[in-house]
């Protein structure tokens, strides 16, 4: 660590005095101190002498000697006071710039340590400090305003009591800058815009920041638009708003609009799309198939997407039959708006009953006219089976009727013993009927098919079973011949 001679922490001299400060180190040494006149510097290897023959109040300050080659970076310091009865203050800088919440050092150095008891900080023209100004004083450094605020950006003077009167320093301007967290915040309204040619439109681009120094512009495709800004300051933020008003839109106005704001921290931008159309439009679509099949007792949501401009003047769900004349309950229909021009309408059909199969239509109206989208809802049923014994053209025949949707397939089984249902161990014979006769097949109704099994002689210790199945389930009917006639067993419920 270098050593300073005289080896005192502070030195008090009068104006005009000769001052010699010598610094000695192991290697070469350097002096650092306030920029002031009349100093002469003489260096000789490991020592350096700073001297003046005519000390003035401007030489007041801390002089530090460092040894650049020292890896520990040690230094020694001495504080010099040049006590001028006419000049109690040496101001090292007339402008101080800090960010909000930093400590601001106003570097007015006291030239006479005796005066410390009577110092104060004031604003220029003797105005008092703003409320909540928290500051401290050090004779060797000046006044420190702690955690400076933007509002404390003022001109200050340091005051000292000399012989009963206050003597002021020259003024120091403090600039407290807002801490800018990033580029300005942006909004662009609306997020999307549609207009018919000839209508009026408005697009609003606004940006805000804690600091006034930022730019904002609205760009159409690649053209910067010349729009006068409206500026405001509220909630401790500066706001700039650009409003594009178009009295009569044309196709040239369509396209991409970008709201761009920039400051020292960077740039933000946000975009929207403006569509200009020739006339009103109303488009209905669904991501679902318009032909729906659902198992009876289950639920279904029918969804329609609507794209429209201008907005809808009316809409509703209608049941078009063919069963009852019931209409969907309004509470089962709901609408959600995805954005200004797109909506989703949903009809909820819980626990579907047979009478609710049929056509459901969504109708919507706007100035462009009426549009409808119709769903066809068919219910799926597991097969219901019945078997009877009859004679056809003199031949004994088992007749199986199966009803369900989708159309059931029919299989006959002959098994030993009397049973409600043939199992694999008992089966004697199996016949598949690939083409049962379709007795009825109306839209939205069950399909009824009939299958015939010609039996020359009914074996009395056997069971004949008709089984029907479709994608929903299966059903069966067991026919047991009895000497006194025939006995049938429907499936257990």
């Amino acid at each position: 660590i270098p050593v300073i001679e005289p080896s005192v922490p502070e030195l008090v001299v009068k104006p005009g005095a000769t001052v010699t400060l010598r610094c000695v180190g192991n290697g070469s040494v350097e002096w650092d101190g306030p920029p002031s006149p009349h100093w002469t510097l003489y260096s000789d290897g490991s020592s350096s002498i700073l001297s003046t023959n005519n000390a003035t109040f401007q030489n007041t300050g801390t002089y530090r000697c460092t040894e650049p080659g020292d890896p520990l970076g040690g230094s020694a310091a001495i504080h010099l006071y040049v006590k001028d009865p006419a000049r109690p203050w040496n101001v090292l800088a007339q402008e101080v710039v800090v960010f909000e919440d930093q400590d601001a050092l106003l570097p007015c150095l006291l030239t006479d340590p005796v005066l410390e008891a009577g110092v104060s900080l004031v604003r220029v023209r003797g105005r008092p400090l703003m409320r909540h100004t928290n500051y401290s004083f050090s004779p060797g450094h000046g006044f420190t305003i702690h955690r400076a605020k933007f509002i404390q950006s003022q001109d200050y003077q340091c005051s000292a009591l000399m012989g009963g009167r206050k003597v002021m320093s020259i003024s120091i301007r403090l600039k407290v800058q807002k801490v800018i967290p990033g580029p300005p915040a942006l909004t662009l309204v609306p997020a999307e815009l549609v207009r018919i040619r000839g209508e009026a439109a408005q697009i609003v681009c606004s940006a805000s920041s804690v600091d006034v120094n930022f730019d904002v512009f609205l760009q159409h495709n690649n053209t910067k638009l010349a729009i006068p800004q409206q500026s405001d300051f509220h909630n401790n933020r500066y706001q700039k708003v650009l409003t594009l008003n178009l009295d009569q839109v044309d196709f040239q106005h369509a396209g991409n609009y970008s709201c761009v704001a920039s400051n020292v921290q960077g740039k933000h931008s946000t975009s929207m799309f403006f569509r200009v159309v020739e006339s009103a439009y109303l488009n209905l679509s669904s991501e679902q198939n318009l032909i729906q099949e659902v198992t009876v007792g289950e639920g279904l949501n029918l969804k329609v997407m609507v794209e429209a401009y201008p907005g809808l003047q009316g809409f509703n769900w209608t049941y078009l039959g063919p069963f009852s004349d019931h209409q969907p309950e309004p509470k089962l229909a709901n609408a959600t708006t995805k954005d200004t021009y797109r909506h989703t309408f949903t009809l909820s059909l819980p626990r579907l009953k047979p009478s609710e199969a049929g056509r459901y239509s969504f109708l919507a109206r706007n100035p462009g006219g009426w549009r409808a989208l119709t769903f066809e809802l068919t219910l799926r049923y597991p097969p219901e089976v019945s078997v009877i014994w009859t004679f056809i053209n003199g031949s004994g025949t088992l007749l199986c009727a199966a009803s369900g949707y989708p159309q059931p397939n029919v299989t006959w089984l002959q098994c030993s013993g009397h049973t409600d249902r043939c199992d694999e161990a008992q089966v004697l014979q199996v016949w598949d009927d690939p083409y049962p006769e379709v007795l009825s097949q109306e839209p939205f109704h069950k399909v009824t098919v009939q299958s015939l099994l010609t039996v020359e002689t009914l074996e009395h210790n056997q069971t004949y079973e008709c089984r029907a199945h479709n994608s929903v389930g299966s059903g069966s009917w067991a026919f047991i011949p009895i000497s006194a006639g025939a006995h049938t067993h429907p499936p257990d419920e």
């Epitope: 800004q229 178009l246 106005h253």
Partner: antibody, heavy 123, light 107 residues
Framework: EVQLQQSGPELEKPGASVKISCKAS????????MNWVKQSNGKSLEWIGN????????TYNQKFKGKATLTVDKSSSTAYMQLKSLTSEDSAVYYC????????????????WGAGTTVTVSS | DIQMTQSSSYLSVSLGGRVTITCKAS??????LAWYQQKPGNAPRLLIS???SLETGVPSRFSGSGSGKDYTLSITSLQTEDVVTYYC?????????FGSGTKLEIK
Amino acid sequence: EVQLQQSGPELEKPGASVKISCKASGYSFTGYNMNWVKQSNGKSLEWIGNIDPYYGGTTYNQKFKGKATLTVDKSSSTAYMQLKSLTSEDSAVYYCARRGDYSGSSYWYFDVWGAGTTVTVSS
Amino acid sequence: DIQMTQSSSYLSVSLGGRVTITCKASDHINNWLAWYQQKPGNAPRLLISGATSLETGVPSRFSGSGSGKDYTLSITSLQTEDVVTYYCQQYWSTPFTFGSGTKLEIK
């Protein structure tokens, strides 16, 4: 030479409408926004609004919304201002003024002015 | 709206002398201020924009200064043709507003 030539004086009855014109020459008409300024009887100046001749965008001083309508005819490099429902309060000299420093920046001072159109409203 | 106040409606001046015209904004306008000169029966003429920038062709005896809310137009070596009315205008925020004007008169 950059010039803005305004239409002649107008004498109108209360309740009537008037449309005054401002023909631009010596520069690209669509490149600079056109502003309109009112000066009542030697008094101060009031900004009415502006129009972007290329794009058609308008900005009005709220005080003149509904009173003034700004339009342009690009083919003849002419800007128009229509004043409706005239009253004696509308008697004034109306100037068209070109916005200076066209660069998409936000500077809205007026570097070229028309000579003014005097509108007198009297029964 | 931002109000622009020109505190002196009239100022008595001496030819060859110096005059300072003041303009105060009701809010901070970030130096977005223009000065205009208007001769009787004529349209206003732009002298200064950006509070300090002299327009091309405007004599150097005109100068502008100020910041924040307070601005001044100074004319040195006053000529006869300068004894007219001067307006300030802010273009920081719409609606753009003008001061009420300061008319110079020879003492």
